[in-house]
């Protein structure tokens, strides 16, 4: 004979555990059902009755099989210095992170809780680490030989051309001046050409922390022996 | 408007059984996630949890009293019993009934009846 | 039985002070706790479920917080109408009341 399928609520064998998408609620003593993403417990299961769940209300979510009584708020809108790549559904939280020109200077679970303007490399110094999503520009001196006359995040130490006539010798921050009318480049020690970074940036002035206004839905992730689920166990 | 009230003897002998009744109006025992509680608070202590009736007939008590204790419902007359034997002194509490959430917890509650037991 | 231990017993306060009364499980209770609080001659009253939703009508000087074994009440602005015991109460397995906490005015 087959084994017969046990219906939620159901009492687990002794040691035994609760199946996928069930949990063991302590109060009955039983094997419940959990609610699907996008839903939350409603009525909490007992001897005789399941689980009952209902839709999140607007703002809200849950992106985990759970048996939370309320769903979780969805993040604020999303600060001036970031781009919302996810929006809020039933389902998932809004994700915002850092539009081009920034980098996050603070991250969440999802997304970016803090954006900051990358570094400007000044005059006489060129990018040596291009920006990143999560990390800022780092600048360097220009070696001898090479030279960066702009304030920029993405251009890097170049080197001076080479004159037949030098009219005026090049420094950290300026290209030699040539009197002759055919100039060459050479390729200084240090004229390494970096690539650029990973994402297109706009050029901007020193690090300013811009506060986001998207603090971080956290998801309280329980310890113990029967967890809501919501952020902890998924399917 | 939820209202609760909870009605039975004031004074009760040692060993006697205790009667109480909770009377509600505003919602009904037959709609799903609805519970009535009974909770106690003796002279001077805490809140105790004594017993929870859900709406589909399952029971819960506590389990130092379990062995004293019974609850009931009457869907139809909008009521809630408990019964509680082999009372004594220590038992001199104030009785409350209170309608408990589909998430459990209390939100509702009577006025209390007070009981005192003594010979 | 999970037991719930509510501290302080008692407390004196004066108006507009902040004020913190904790409960701490004896194992984890994932955030299933409702605070209550109780004025003499008068019915119990929930101020707050599930750890930190605040009922309808109560106050946005209560809040609250926590999770895993440790709960915290916390009134940002004590006012004389605040005076009463506040119970906290436990309803991840079955349901404890934690020993209560009177509250007074200086």
């Known amino acids: 004979l087959p084994a017969q399928v046990a219906f939620t609520p159901y009492a687990p064998e002794p040691g035994g555990t609760c199946r996928l998408r069930e949990y063991y609620d302590q109060t009955a003593q039983m094997c419940c059902s959990k609610c699907p993403p996008g839903q939350h417990a409603k009525v909490f299961c007992t001897k005789t009755s399941d689980t009952v769940c209902d839709s999140c209300e607007d703002s809200t979510y849950t992106q985990l099989w759970n048996w939370v009584p309320e769903c979780l708020s969805c993040g604020s809108r999303c600060s001036s210095d970031q781009v919302e790549t996810q929006a809020c559904t039933r389902e998932q939280n809004r994700i915002c992170t850092c539009r081009p020109g920034w980098y996050c200077a603070l991250s969440k679970q999802e997304g970016c809780r803090l954006c900051a303007q990358l570094r400007k490399c000044r005059p006489g110094f060129g990018v040596a680490r291009p920006g990143t999503e999560t990390s800022d520009v780092v600048c360097k001196p220009c070696a001898p030989g090479t030279f960066s006359n702009t304030t920029s995040s993405t251009d890097i130490c170049r080197p001076h051309q080479i004159c037949h006539v030098v009219a005026i010798p090049g420094n950290a921050s300026m290209d030699a001046v040539c009197t002759s009318t055919s100039p060459t480049r050479s390729m200084a020690p240090g004229a390494v050409h970096l690539p650029q970074p990973v994402s297109t940036r706009s050029q901007h002035t020193q690090p300013t922390p811009a506060p986001s206004t998207a603090p971080g839905t956290s998801f309280l992730l329980p310890v113990g022996p029967s967890p809501p689920a919501e952020g902890s166990t998924g399917d | 408007q939820v209202t609760l009230k909870e009605s039975g003897p004031t004074l009760v002998k040692p060993t006697q059984t205790l009667t109480l009744t909770c009377t509600f109006s505003g919602f009904s025992l037959s709609t799903l996630g609805m519970g009535v509680g009974w909770i106690r608070q003796p002279p001077g202590k805490a809140l105790e949890w004594l017993a929870h009736?859900?709406?589909?007939?399952?029971?819960y008590y506590n389990p130092a009293l379990k062995s004293r204790l019974t609850i009931t419902k009457d869907t139809s007359k909008n009521q809630v019993v408990l019964t509680m034997t082999n009372m004594d002194p220590v038992d001199t509490a104030t009785y409350y009934c209170?309608?408990?959430?589909?998430?459990?917890?209390?939100?509702?509650w009577g006025q209390g009846t007070t009981v005192t037991v003594s010979s | 039985d999970i037991q719930m231990t509510q501290s302080p017993s008692s407390l004196s306060a004066s108006v507009g002070d902040r004020v913190t009364i904790t409960c701490k499980a004896s194992q984890n209770i994932n955030k299933f706790i409702a605070w209550y609080q109780h004025k003499p001659g008068k019915v119990p009253k929930l101020l707050i479920h599930?750890?930190?939703t605040l009922q309808p009508g109560v106050p946005s000087r209560f809040s609250g917080s926590g999770s895993g074994s440790d709960y915290t009440l916390t009134i940002s602005s004590l006012q004389p109408e605040d005076v009463a015991t506040y119970y906290c109460l436990q309803y991840g397995v079955l349901w404890t009341f934690g020993g209560g906490t009177k509250v007074e005015i200086k």
């Open positions: 209170a309608r408990m959430t589909g998430t459990r917890y209390f939100d509702v």
């Open positions: 599930y750890t930190s």
């Open positions: 009736i859900w709406w589909d007939a399952d029971k």
